[in-house]
């Protein structure tokens, strides 16, 4: 079953996907698509990287992380209810039937009537609560993990930690990750 991620209408949604390049700059083609991962490719492709660069993208879909280090997490800008659904991240590892694929379910909620504090909204948009646990090889099953609930009193602490990049690294290490090589 798909791992579920949530965002509100008007926010940016974040769908994590990572791999570890065999060597720096030794990138693997990746595609993102709307719809569950089919046997090949990514259904309706919205973004694609090759061995060097992002070589195809459509409006509102972009990679915010350092894809050259294997962070191929997808950001969808200014989401609407129509963005709900399953997305496919496919890491196209060369060889015989080597692809790794991840189905991620995005649930878009209507915007709250009372705007939430900016910091909290930014945090929840950038780092969803539900993450897949880190895998240690292509054969390992990705399982579902959960971050603890975050309340308002924690936001300033979290913001400081984000500035230090410590939490960002921890969250990255909790993402769906594939080691190549």
């Amino acid at each position: 079953s798909e791992v579920e991620y949530r965002a509100e209408v008007g926010q940016n949604a974040y769908l994590p996907c990572f791999y570890t390049p065999a060597a720096p700059g030794n990138l693997v083609p990746v595609c993102w698509g709307k719809g569950a991962c089919p046997v090949f490719e990514c259904g309706n492709v919205v973004l694609r990287t090759d061995e060097r660069d992002v070589n195809y993208w459509t409006s509102r879909y972009w990679l915010n992380g350092d894809f050259r280090k294997g962070d191929v997490s997808l950001t969808i800008e200014n989401v609407t209810l129509a963005d709900s659904g399953i997305y496919c991240c496919r890491i196209q590892i060369p060889g015989i039937m080597n692809d790794e694929k991840f189905n991620l379910k995005l649930v878009i909620k209507p915007a709250k009537v009372t705007p939430a504090p900016t910091r909290q909204r930014d945090f929840t948009a950038a780092f969803p609560r539900m993450l897949t646990t880190r895998g240690h090889g292509p054969a390992e099953t990705q399982t579902l993990g959960s971050l603890p609930d975050i309340n308002l009193t924690q936001i300033s602490t979290l913001a400081n930690e984000l500035r230090d990049s410590r939490l960002a690294n921890d969250l990255r290490d909790s993402g769906a990750t594939i080691r190549i090589g």
Partner: antibody
Framework: EVKLVESGGGLVQPGGSLRLSCAAS????????MAWVRQAPGKGLEWVAN????????YYLDSLKSRFTISRDNAKNSLYLQMNSLRAEDTAVYYC???????????????WGQGTLVTVSS | DIQMTQSPSSLSASVGDRVTITCRAS??????LAWYQQKPGKAPKLLVY???TLAEGVPSRFSGSGSGTDFTLTISSLQPEDFATYYC?????????FGQGTKLEIK
């Protein structure tokens, strides 16, 4: 006009080898996954193998992957199937087919060649 | 492997009839299903892809529906050239698999 033309079929003894070719025209060959599908006489369709745009990723029917190798030459707009250690049960018409394109979306074998008959018999 | 089961295996019908062929997948394949028509001695021809999208040049009397595990191909009014064998095929899991075929014959 999209055209796929297979060649290389024929009669071969059990244990022998054959190399099938498929010449493609009428589309940008390197923008599509390509496939081989076979059909034994009087039987249904069976997928054999697929290959991605540049040949770096290949996909096979499990029972065939130790004997069959799919490859492509984008400079020649050609697809190949190397078949080794052939068995009587490999007797079939082998079709070359165009699969999904670079931007996904259309999941089906949109174009097929006319097929080439491979007969494995002593 | 995902098994694709078509029914019926054969079907007799007359010109002008409405005909429905069903295909059931052993697992969820979302909408990654295609339908093909094959005539004796000829290559298959794509009719429908992604479960319900009509392929280029296919007459509008053909239509596809369904998602998940249950799919149908409908011919709204049979024409003489429609008598053939029809196959469904999934593009979701490896290996790609076809149904066993439905032979549509003249009554």
């Amino acid at each position: 006009e999209v055209k796929l033309v297979e060649s290389g079929g024929g009669l071969v003894q059990p244990g022998g080898s054959l190399r099938l070719s498929c010449a493609a025209s009428g589309f940008t060959f390197s923008d599509y996954y390509m496939a081989w599908v076979r059909q034994a006489p009087g039987k249904g369709l069976e997928w054999v193998a697929n290959i991605n745009y540049d040949g770096s990723s290949t996909y096979y029917l499990d029972s065939l992957k130790s004997r069959f190798t799919i490859s492509r030459d984008n400079a020649k707009n050609s697809l190949y199937l190397q078949m080794n250690s052939l068995r009587a049960e490999d007797t079939a018409v082998y079709y070359c087919a165009r699969d999904v394109g670079y931007y996904g979306g259309n999941y089906g074998f949109a174009y097929w060649g006319q097929g080439t008959l491979v007969t494995v018999s002593s | 492997d995902i098994q694709m089961t078509q029914s019926p295996s054969s079907l007799s019908a007359s010109v002008g009839d409405r005909v429905t062929i069903t295909c059931r997948a052993s697992d969820n394949i979302y909408s990654y299903l295609a339908w093909y028509q094959q005539k004796p001695g000829k290559a298959p021809k794509l009719l429908v892809y992604n479960a319900k999208t009509l392929a280029e040049g296919v007459p509008s009397r053909f239509s596809g529906s369904g998602s998940g595990t249950d799919f149908t191909l409908t011919i709204s009014s049979l024409q003489p050239e429609d008598f053939a064998t029809y196959y469904c095929q999934q593009h979701y899991g490896s290996p790609l698999t076809f149904g066993q075929g439905t032979k549509l014959e003249i009554k």
